[in-house]
């Protein structure tokens, strides 16, 4: 099909981040067409000289695929017709970081936006009670992080106290030598208190909560991407 | 600031060979394909070779595939364009140029090449 | 492979509008970037992705595509604007037009 008259077209994406070893999304929507057989999707990544993904007259277009995204991309093809274009990247590598770009053709016009994605490793921490410990210990573990994070202990009595004197926080690299596992101590915890583990590098942030009192203990964890809109 | 700059270039008899480097400052070179685009006297511009930020892929033009090479030194900033078998229509101003999506933002000033005997 | 065809010449009047036109099979659905290249001087990216402008390139400097054609236009030119103008594609390498020379009469 050929484009008769110059119109831009509305293309966006969200920036995102992967976690290594998983499947990752790449966002991106993009004003719909009427003919699926009219519209291309072309996904470009900086540095690379072949094309990520493409997709044209409704099914994947691969001859130019770079060999790094062999066999790892696919397009949602059932909802490309109402305007999705985002990309689903197959066992997520480290090298998979930088700036993709979404590039769109339709009988509309043309369109593109770039985005941002990260990639790293990220995990819940889960948080126990130690009771192998001599004291009161809490044991903080997440099993996969990448780049290796900082872990701040807080807690809901003492708010804003430093418990850097009083924890000890080790990493240990995992078997295929790019995440590591972290485990985080806290000693001298007391009843009637909730606790906070607290794990962060520059791609994710994710919080364990243990509450114990004399008769139960109640954990919750949460994780949040940074920098991300998703 | 970003900056190319190309060495290497000189006057060389037809079969021999010569190597020309691009010089890469101000960016993260690493990141970015690179492209070698020459310019015969008095003619337009002739793509030549294009190399992948990881150095992992690389394109040529036909008309120098098998004896040309496009390589990089990521650890040193550095592009290479390994000339063989050198022709005299092979003779022209070799440019290095940063690949940006699908085009070239940055440019080098270029280094002449003569092939003569 | 895939062509691109310019006009070898085009000529100007200063203060007025020049446009450069760049022909190629069904080029509105591909990218198109516009260099200019001055006497002895490398090239220089003035239209990137069909029509827009790198920062520092004057917004005299505009492109469109559709079709079969691509085109550059160069709104109030000046005597500086004199230069080789060059179309290109990227077709599993990059392809250049055959090149236009604008003259300031």
């Known amino acids: 099909f050929g484009i008769s008259g110059r119109h831009s077209i509305t293309v966006t994406t969200v920036a995102s981040a992967g976690n290594i070893g998983e499947d990752g999304i790449l966002s991106c929507t993009f004003e719909p067409d009427i003919k699926l057989s009219d519209i291309v999707i072309q996904w470009l990544k900086e540095g690379v000289l072949g094309l990520v993904h493409e997709f044209k007259e409704g099914k994947d277009e691969l001859s130019e695929q770079d060999e790094m995204f062999r066999g790892r991309t696919a397009v949602f093809a059932d909802q490309v017709i109402v305007g999705n274009a985002s990309l689903r990247l197959k066992n997520v590598q480290l090298t998979d970081a930088g700036t993709y770009k979404c590039y769109i053709i339709t009988s509309k016009g043309k369109g593109n936006a770039n985005l941002e994605y990260k990639t790293g490793a990220f995990s819940m921490p889960e948080v126990n009670v130690d009771y192998n410990a001599s004291s009161e210990t809490l044991r903080c573990e997440a099993p996969r992080w990448f780049p290796q994070p900082t872990v701040v202990w807080a807690s809901q009595v003492d708010q804003g106290a430093n418990f850097s004197e009083v924890s000890n926080t080790s990493f240990e690299l995992n078997s295929e030598n790019v995440t590591m596992k972290v485990v985080s101590v806290l000693y001298n915890v007391t009843i009637n208190n909730t606790y906070s583990c607290m794990i962060e590098n520059d791609i994710a942030k994710a919080t364990g909560d243990i509450k114990v009192t004399e008769s139960e203990i109640k954990r919750r964890s949460h994780l949040q991407l940074l920098n991300s809109k998703a | 600031e970003v900056q190319l700059v190309e060495s290497g270039g000189g006057v060389v008899q037809p079969g021999r060979s010569l190597r020309l480097s691009c010089a890469a400052s101000?960016?993260?070179?690493?990141?970015?394909?690179m492209n070698w685009v020459r310019q015969a006297p008095g003619k337009g511009l002739e793509w030549v070779s294009a190399i992948s930020g990881s150095g992992a892929t690389t394109y040529y033009a036909d008309s120098v595939k098998g004896r040309f090479t496009i390589s990089r030194d990521n650890s040193k900033n550095t592009l290479y364009l390994q000339m063989n078998s050198l022709r005299a229509e092979d003779t022209a101003v070799y440019y290095c140029?940063?690949?940006?999506?699908?085009?070239?933002?940055?440019w080098g000033q270029g280094t002449t090449v003569t092939v003569s005997s | 492979s895939y062509e691109l065809t310019q006009p070898p010449s085009v000529s100007v009047a200063p203060g007025k509008t020049a446009r450069i036109t760049c022909g190629g099979n069904n080029i509105g659905v591909k990218a198109v970037h516009w260099y200019q290249q001055k006497p002895g001087q490398a090239p220089v990216l003035v239209v990137y992705d069909d029509s827009d402008r790198p920062s520092g390139i004057p917004e005299r400097f505009s492109g469109s595509n559709s079709g079969n054609t691509a085109t550059l236009t160069i709104s109030r030119v000046e005597a500086g604007d004199e230069a080789d103008y060059y179309c290109?594609?990227?077709?599993?390498?990059?392809?250049f037009g055959t090149g236009t020379k604008l003259t300031v009469l």
């Open positions: 140029a940063r690949k940006r999506w699908y085009g070239m933002d940055v």
């Open positions: 290109q594609v990227w077709d599993r390498g990059m392809i």
């Open positions: 101000g960016f993260t070179f690493s990141n970015k394909a």
